[in-house]
Amino acid sequence: EKSDYGNLTLAEDTNIGSTILTIQATDADEPFTGSSKILYHIIKGDSEGRLGVDTDPHTNTGYVIIKKPLDFETAAVSNIVFKAENPEPLVFGVKYNASSFAKFTLIVTDVNEAPQFSQHVFQAKVSEDVAIGTKVGNVTAKDPEGLDISYSLRGDTRGWLKIDHVTGEIFSVAPLDREAGSPYRVQVVATEVGGSSLSSVSEFHLILMDVNDNPPRLAKDYTGLFFCHPLSAPGSLIFEATDDDQHLFRGPHFTFSLGSGSLQNDWEVSKINGTHARLSTRHTEFEEREYVVLIRINDGGRPPLEGIVSLPVTFCSCVEGSCFRPAGHQTGIPTVGM
């Protein structure tokens, strides 16, 4: 009915699904048949497929709707051409003519948009022992209007990081520690400079690679170890070591030895596996008291770290397999017998 629908001006944030134009064509063939039904197709000016046309089959009215977000920055003005046609082919010799085509000009107006990060999550990987001031990562955002960006960090609870607010480069400002938690997650805020202060948020995940910086230690509390006195035969007990460093693909490989030479007459340590060792008495002549046995544990790492731990072992009189103490001497009663 109409070949030029003129100019249509819309803001680039117009909702998807909005009907922006109603078009009407007529067909002289028998109503409600394939010969008179009209379908509308956009044939030019919308290569991005931002628009679509729905047809009411009863009235042959076409409704131009927004299928994808409009974008002022990529297409401020579009000359849209659409075609009205039947779903059934025309009879031989009849062609669609100029009256089967119509057009309108879509003018998209700019709406100030927030900056857009190039990624939802930025990841970086560094060794936990990097020097303070080392660049550990980089984030980038762009403003659709071409304005500059000011970057800031949010949620840097450990105070480890600083972002260059102009370039988005992230630097360490304190010693990092994998054992405190890796990856370390913070939020990055990109704010548009130049008035509106619209902002967007992304994540920065800092994966910390392990450095052997934790000496071995006992895996649990070994207070309360005891042997019944007097020993009838040499005895032994098993203990476990651990450390807080990362042990990929294989467990720790600790080596164990006595912490001082003076202990060697009374005790010996033998390795069971990478984490467990056995402490044995060399004889039975021990006094009825507590002995503190120092054990040296080496992790064999790079660099190798060593921990000296103490195992307190009590020799005491036993009643039914438990350490006996007269009333009034209850403090620190051992609870684990050998």
């Epitope: 762009k142 403003d143 071409g146 304005l147 500059d148 960006i149 000011s150 970057y151 800031s152 260059d164 607010h165 102009v166 370039t167 480069e169 704010t191 400079v193 130049g194 008035g195 202060s197």
Partner: antibody, heavy 120, light 108 residues
């Protein structure tokens, strides 16, 4: 028109501090980064740091961290730079400069400079 | 830090002569973040060319800039008396932003 007016020359003793100002006019102060650059005959132009008066975000050259503090007062459209523990090496002309709001990060307007002389 | 090396340090040119000075970066710089400033004695630097090849407001058309990666240049097609000054290149791809040590252009 855009102008950055810096405070006057300073003669200070070693170990002392100095605070200089950079008053902006002719544009929206809170919408542009203000940078500080120093110039010495020996070192040429050296970037010290920058502040975004809109929210106070700042960045420093690692070389000047701990030596310099940058602040901005929105009400007077003035940026400030405080230099601490001055030595003879800090004798220089200090410039403030506005960074363009476009993504080029160029410094499109500069103050006239503040000359700092450190001498006992 | 990205180091910018300018050459020559000092050059002289006759009026009307074509002049080219270069700026070499220690690592690649995006052309968007490479700028040139002009400074005359007793004055502050002035933005002269931004993003490698765009002339700042008021800069005569005889000036041009080009380059990419680590190699950039400023050219004057025909030297004029008022072009005598020191020219600094500047990168702001990475923090800290850095400046070249300058090329001092004199009239022969």
């Amino acid at each position: 028109q855009v102008q950055l007016q810096q405070s006057g020359a300073e003669l200070v003793k070693p170990g002392a501090s100095v605070r200089m100002s950079c008053k902006s006019s002719g544009y929206t102060f809170t919408s542009y980064n203000i940078h500080w650059v120093r110039q010495t005959p020996g070192q040429g132009l050296e970037w010290i740091g920058a502040i975004y008066p809109g929210n106070g975000d700042n960045s420093y050259n690692q070389k000047f961290r701990g030596k310099v503090t940058l602040t901005a007062d929105k009400s007077s459209s003035t940026a400030y730079m405080q230099l601490n523990s001055l030595t003879s090496e800090d004798s220089a002309v200090y410039y403030c400069a506005r960074q363009t709001a476009r993504t080029t990060r160029a410094m499109d307007y500069w103050g006239q400079g503040t000359t700092v002389t450190v001498s006992s | 830090d990205i180091v910018l090396t300018q050459s020559p340090a000092i050059m002289s040119a006759s009026l009307g002569e074509r002049v080219t000075m270069t700026c070499t970066a220690s690592s690649s710089v995006s052309s968007s973040y490479l700028h040139w400033y002009q400074q005359k004695p007793g004055s502050s630097p002035k933005l002269w060319i931004y993003s490698t090849s765009n002339l700042a407001s008021g800069v005569p058309a005889r000036f041009s800039g080009s380059g990419s990666g680590t190699s950039y240049s400023l050219t004057i097609s025909s030297m004029a008396a008022e072009d005598a000054a020191t020219y600094y290149c500047h990168q702001y791809l990475r923090s800290p932003p850095t400046f070249g040590s300058g090329t001092k252009l004199e009239i022969k």
